[in-house]
Each structure stands twice: as structure tokens, then as C-alpha cells.
Amino acid sequence: IVLRPPRVHNSEENTMRALTLKDILNGTFSYKTFFPNWISGQEYLHQSADNNIVLYNIETGQSYTILSNRTMKSVNASNYGLSPDRQFVYLESDYSKLWRYSYTATYYIYDLSNGEFVRGNELPRPIQYLCWSPVGSKLAYVYQNNIYLKQRPGDPPFQITFNGRENKIFNGIPDWVYEEEMLATKYALWWSPNGKFLAYAEFNDTDIPVIAYSYYGDEQYPRTINIPYPKAGAKNPFVRIFIIDTTYPAYVGPQEVPVPAMIASSDYYFSWLTWVTDERVCLQWLKRVQNVSVLSICDFREDWQTWDCPKTQEHIEESRTGWAGGFFVSTPVFSYDAISYYKIFSDKDGYKHIHYIKDTVENAIQITSGKWEAINIFRVTQDSLFYSSNEFEDYPGRRNIYRISIGSYPPSKKCVTCHLRKERCQYYTASFSDYAKYYALVCYGPGIPISTLHDGRTDQEIKILEENKELENALKNIQLPKEEIKKLEVDEITLWYKMILPPQFDRSKKYPLLIQVYGGPCSQSVRSVFAVNWISYLASKEGMVIALVDGRGTAFQGDKLLYAVYRKLGVYEVEDQITAVRKFIEMGFIDEKRIAIWGWSYGGYVSSLALASGTGLFKCGIAVAPVSSWEYYASVYTERFMGLPTKDDNLEHYKNSTVMARAEYFRNVDYLLIHGTADDNVHFQNSAQIAKALVNAQVDFQAMWYSDQNHGLSGLSTNHLYTHMTHFLKQCFSLSD
């Protein structure tokens, strides 16, 4: 199945050129998406090309600038946020990145009624997180790990917490491990729907071991970065959830929400908080051994001014074959009765599907079913439920948006996107306005991405928001590689793969093969999306065949495949890459003497193990920022899939699954090991240990470090990295420079 349709029929092949590495590094062929910043059922904000903030009304067709680029520029603002009462806008500047999601910034409040910045009781700087209440213009913000509340932007702040301390106590923001592995946000505070209450998490990292690494900078002495970072088996953060009445914050102060008894009996995590009404909140908790999750619905007790979480409102989700959920435990989407909800979890056949839960999980009504998976619930209204799945035509790497009419019986299902632009668009996400009056569809491919606006009642397309015309024109004279998505059936396992083929691909010829691997639990690499990236260049210009394979442990194809790697990371993911390579060789167009593998992060781990598999399949390979031992990685992530590194649990496999244990097997391959020295996520320690083991085994290898770079190897390092890797591969494949 050729997924990238030809865009132009040009008989003059000589006017077409191949992609260059410069094209990729300059981002020449990057695309744009359009996500409306919804502010009501029919209005949204969007930052125009000239940086004005424009309000669009879909129903009147009118638009006007609510904030000029001049005002934005006056404080060097790179972001904004309109208060729900539309009286104020916060302007964000001095953005300073911390970890994956977190950053600090300076905030200015602009008063739209008088066209001036609010003076007096200005916000401190730098702020770690700031947000408006959902109604009106109250402000909550986190400064120096403490939470503050303002009733109005010009008012003095009310300090909610006092115990915040750098690297010790975090209020309203997550610590490193919660940010990266549990919440996937920069915040840990949540307003109730009408802004009456504010819930927040407190993380106590006092007893967590610290990772320390040098940051070289430009000074005479490097500084040391210290991060409380629990590695597998180490002491974890202790979390508590509090709720404060924002109308009378000093009255009873923050009230702690009780933890379910079955959770509190041993180490546990808080996984998410969902407000249902102003006086009902839903908390999700997870045992440290992450196969038991408890969803707890708590009610405000007016008489006691406390939060009550009755046992009858605790719902347990347990996995007997793996961990709870997919990558994360799914979150509930509540119904209009404010007690029942929709949630995605495994059905009896081991596929993740939408269920409706009212009184108990045992009595759940299954809403979707089949040998495919429901992936995300976007919105539930009085009569419709919108969700995405990979059901259509049995391609796990697609995403289509569906609507189920839940206001009538039997509920009927309609695919909203399946036939809209079938060749161009097979991978969608959506963004809904209030009450799903309107929605935007964002198509990521396989053709050029396009964003469109739709009527939430009829699904009619209203207008195109972004169609990437400039990109389409720019690609007209580019010889893009061909892409196909197919599957291999091997020993009752389906291995989906994406193959990227040189433009003039000829099946009768032999090509070098590069495997690009990630392969982490609950990941998916074989997706029907558009991309012009480094591997596109390698196929287009350097004539390589590139393949991506989703093996055991990957997502959206059922629990059998997903949980196959449970407690056994580093085994089946590697086996399946090797199996696929053997199948590719059988296809007849692969030069079996020129096969390489590369990966980043988890992919670096898999590529290292594949190179050290002793199969003789791979001539060379690259590992960028690899994990080398699961004892070095974060507790929350690692233990989810591996259990604990203790004798009575899974220590044996922790030890057996290291890259270092296979040092001897690197002797007959060319290995390029790359890592950033300031990697807060997969610590440089991982590559340092690989290098040490290889040296001790007297195995030759190549290595590159990037000073002061984190897990993303961004900026100039990116250019250097891809140039370096290109040279390495061309040398390995004996391709002339």
C-alpha cells in the first residue's frame, strides 16, 4: 500500500531534485497545524502571522484583534492567556525551559478595558506556573514552589502554601519524575469548574536520592545540577492532595483529600485529578507496583468543610497480565449526571475500549468493541460521544474520529473522518469548542497535513484553517521517497512495518537497509503520518531503504502484544526487530552485507542490544542517549514494566538485560554511541557505563558526547549530530561522500 500519493505528475524528471541534509536541518519542509484556542461554543482566539491576537466568531463570521502585536512586543511576549471574563490577558515572556514540560517565565497582566498593564501588586518573577480560574479572573500561580491566589489581577496575593522549598517540597508543580512519567504536565493544580475550589498536589522529595551532573557552561568551574530523581527501587516522592476554597481561602485553609485505604497501605502514586462539579472531584491513585489503580470520587461536606471519599465511590482497575492502562492509566470523562463516566480500559478480549461506569466497574457497559483499540475520548455531550480509534480498515497506525449517538438506543456509531480526504488524511486528532458546538480536525497525514473547522451537529466542514499550500508548492520539485505500510505475520504475531524506499526504487536491485527503532512499551512507530525528516533524506538522496517495525510491547493492537514485554524488557523488542530484518532480506532487494540499526532513548537501548545480539545481521549501528541498565532509569517508568530490582522480585532480569552484559558481542560491529552530558532524563551515566564495559572488554567503538546538552540534543547540536550520523552510515554502507 503506497501511502504517500504522488503530488505532481512531472514527466521532466530532471527538474526534480533529491532532498538534502541541509533541507532537513533547516526545517525547509516543516508543516503547520491550526488548533483554535476556544473561548466559547462559537469563538476562538488565534495568533496571526503578524502576531496579533485575533478573536474569531464562527457564527457571525466576524473577527477582531483583541491584543495588538505592539502590546505583545512591548514586553517581548511569546505567549498569552485571556481571562474567562475577557477583562484581562496575561502576557508571558522570558521563557526559560526547565524539563520536558516545565519552564519559568515573567508574566504581565494587561487590562483590556483600559488598554493598560495592571500596576501595583505585580507578579513576582520568575513564575513557575500561572493560570486563570475557569470563570472570572482569579489567578493562581506558583512561585518558589509555593502557591498564591489573587482574587483580581491587581489585588495583593494570598499565600496558600508556605513549605515550598527547592528540590524538597513542590506545591502545585510536579517534581522531575511526576512531570516526566506520571502527569506529563508542568502543573499540579486544578481549578474546579466554576472556580470555587482549587486542588493541588504537594510532592515531598526530601528523602529522594539526587542525581548530580556537571554543567560546564563558560565559567572557570562547572556547576553541579542536582535533581531529586528516584531510580528503579529507590525512595519515591510522597504525594498529598489538598483542596482550598478560593472564595474564603483563610477560613479553613487547605483540606487534604483522603487516600483510599487499599492504596495507602503501601507505596503509591497519585496519577490524575478530574473535577466533576464544584463540589465533586475524582482522584486516581496507583500502587507502586503499577497493576492496581483506584479511581476515587470525593464529595464536599458542607457541614465539616472537608472532602469525603466513600468506599462505595471507589472503582478499582486491575491488570492480571501486565500493568494498569496503556502508557498511563486512562482518565474518566464524566456524564451529565455528574457521577457516571466513560473510560478506556481493557475488555475481556484484551483490547482497550470505551466503557461506561455507573455503580461499579463490574457492571460497566462496554461501548466500543472489536479487535482494534479506542485511543482517546475527546468529548461527551448530552447526545454524542466523540472518540478516536484505529478501527478503520484494520490499520493500527491510523487514527479516525468517531461519533457515537448516546442520546438514543441503540447508540449508533459514525466515522466522522474516514472518508473526508481518504488518500491524504488517515491520522487525525480533534479540538472541540464548548458543548462540542464546533470542532477542528487536524490531519497529520499521510499526505500534507491539513486543519479544518466543522459543525459539531452536522459534521459539515465550514472552512479550511490551514492547508500548508507553501509546503505543497515547495515539495513540487522534490523527489520524495515512497512509503508503504504493510505487515508481517510471524509465529502468531503481527509485525506492522513502514518502509521508506528511494524514489527510483527497483525491486530487482539491492539496497542498504537502515532500521529505525524506538520499541518502548506502549509506543507506536508505524503511523500513517506525514514527515520529511532525516530518514526521508537518507532514502531520497543516499538511496537507502529505511524500515520501522512495531514489535511486541508496542501499542494499540491489544494486550497480548502490549504486555508481552512485561517484566522482560530488552528481549522480545529486539527479537522482533531481528525477525523483521530476516523477512526483509527474504524480499530480495536488501543487500544483507549493508544493514544498520539506529535508535534514540529506548530506541538506543534496543539498537544496542540488537547490535550485540550475535546474529551477524547488522554491520553497524547508532545509539543516541540510550538506556543501558534499567537500574539507572526512573522508578515510575521502569517499575511499571519491570517490577522492582530486588531479589524477591525481578533483580535477575534487571541484571540480565543490561547493554554492558553484552559488551563482548560488539566486537564484530561498528558502534557509534552518542549522549548529551546534561541529560536529565536518561543520564549520561548510561553511556559512560557502556563505554567503560567496552573499554574493559577491549572492544573498539566510536563515541560522541554533546556538552551541556539534554535528552533532546537541540540547537546546533542537532545539526552536528545528524551530520555526524550521516557520515557514519555512509562510511558503513561504503557510499561516496
Epitope: 456524564s335 451529565y336 449526571d337 455507573k358 461499579t360 457492571n363 441503540p410
Partner: antibody, heavy 122, light 107 residues
Framework: EVQLLESGGGLVQPGGSLKLSCAAS????????MSWVRQAPGKGLEWIGE????????NYTPSLKDKFIISRDNAKNTLYLQMSKVRSEDTALYYC???????????????WGQGTTVTVSS | ELVMTQSPASLSASVGETVTITCRAS??????LAWYQQKQGKSPQLLVY???TLADGVPSRFSGSGSGTQYSLKINSLQPEDFGSYYC?????????FGGGTKLEIK
């Protein structure tokens, strides 16, 4: 016009069996959840159980679970209640009831039959 | 199983009066409650569902209220046709038990 008509009641000896039927007309029977409810002489209403449109979900009141079986035949627009091991306390007027789907996912008993009497006596 | 306790068991009132019947659940039923009227020798008839929504064709003098475990049915300005028995029933979790009933008689 919606109609539910129960039949099959009568005199049955203790320990015996009986099958009640409920014929539906005037609505799309195959889309409705259906229930059986009974009322002992001079007493209140007691919910027996329910069945969903495609018979994949059947719920009973725990005390009657082992002696009563609810089933349906959508082709015949008929609901059934198979009673076994009956005792004198099963003497009652037996109603079938059905109703509208109420968002989210539950059903009220909007329509009731006139009932059929079951008398358990030796 | 949830127990529904209805009160009073019986009640005498005159035409034109206002009466209130209450129903207490042994656990939170989250407004999943229906009220029925049953006249002598007849089948029950649905009056209210979702604790407060009137069924089609039910006069507006009937109203339901409540939340959590406490619910009530109020009849304003009693009419002659309102006399009979009233039952509450929860729909929170199976079994969907009924209250014991309230017999409303003419004074």
C-alpha cells in the same frame, strides 16, 4: 398504542414450574429493556429482574436468581419468565414492564401490562 | 442491595391540600430515582424519573426533589384522581428495589 399483555398465570403446586409470557405491541420491542415486577396480595411492588434488547445482559434480584429465568424472543415480540421451585410466597400478580432509554444508560418503566396472577397452593 | 424506606406508609389528605412523600435510600443513589402511582386494581404508572423529571403527560402539580439518599415527591393542590398508592424505585445498581409504598387516602 403501546400494549403489554401478560399470560400464563394460574394455579401451580409448591415445587412446580410455570412459564409466563408478555406479548408486546405498538412499539419497537427489540430496542427496549424489559422487566418483570410482582406484587403479592395487599403488598408493595418487588422488582424481579430485567433483560436488555439483545439478551446479552440479564439481571435478577439475588433471592430469585436461582429459580427464575428471564428471556425474550424479539422475532415474536415476546418476553418470558420461567418460574421453577415455586413456593407459597411466590403467589402474586406478575407484571411485565418496559420503557424508554434514559441518558445515560438506564431505562425507566414507562409501560406496564395489566398483570397475570400466579397462585401457589397445594 | 440498597434498601428504600418510604414514609409515611399511609396518609390522609383533602382535595386542594399539598402533600409530600419521602423516600430514603440506604446508600447514595445519585438521583437515579423514579416515582410511580398505582390506583386500586390498576398497573403502576410512571410519574417522575431522574428524581425530578416529570414523565410525559404527568400534571405539573407533581414534583420530585432530593439528592444523595433523601428524596421526596410533592403533590400540590390534590385532585380526586391523585388518591392511590405511590412507590419510589431506585435505578442506581441492581437489584432496582422499590420502597414499601405510601397509601394516599381521601380525608
Amino acid at each position: 398504542e403501546v400494549q403489554l399483555l401478560e399470560s400464563g398465570g394460574g394455579l401451580v403446586q409448591p415445587g412446580g414450574s410455570l412459564k409466563l409470557s408478555c406479548a408486546a405491541s405498538g412499539f419497537d420491542f427489540s430496542r427496549y429493556w424489559m422487566s418483570w415486577v410482582r406484587q403479592a396480595p395487599g403488598k408493595g411492588l418487588e422488582w424481579i429482574g430485567e433483560i436488555n434488547p439483545d439478551s446479552s445482559t440479564i439481571n435478577y434480584t439475588p433471592s430469585l436468581k436461582d429459580k427464575f429465568i428471564i428471556s425474550r424472543d424479539n422475532a415474536k415480540n415476546t418476553l418470558y419468565l420461567q418460574m421453577s421451585k415455586v413456593r407459597s410466597e411466590d403467589t402474586a400478580l406478575y407484571y411485565c414492564a418496559g420503557g424508554y432509554y434514559r441518558y445515560p444508560y438506564y431505562y425507566t418503566m414507562d409501560y406496564w401490562g395489566q398483570g397475570t396472577t400466579v397462585t401457589v397452593s397445594s | 442491595e440498597l434498601v428504600m424506606t418510604q414514609s409515611p406508609a399511609s396518609l390522609s389528605a383533602s382535595v386542594g391540600e399539598t402533600v409530600t412523600i419521602t423516600c430514603r435510600a440506604s446508600g447514595n443513589i445519585h438521583n437515579y430515582l423514579a416515582w410511580y402511582q398505582q390506583k386500586q386494581g390498576k398497573s403502576p404508572q410512571l410519574l417522575v424519573y431522574n428524581a425530578k423529571t416529570l414523565a410525559d403527560g404527568v400534571p405539573s402539580r407533581f414534583s420530585g426533589s432530593g439528592s444523595g439518599t433523601q428524596y421526596s415527591l410533592k403533590i400540590n393542590s390534590l385532585q380526586p384522581e391523585d388518591f392511590g398508592s405511590y412507590y419510589c424505585q431506585h435505578f442506581w445498581s441492581t437489584p432496582y428495589t422499590f420502597g414499601g409504598g405510601t397509601k394516599l387516602e381521601i380525608k
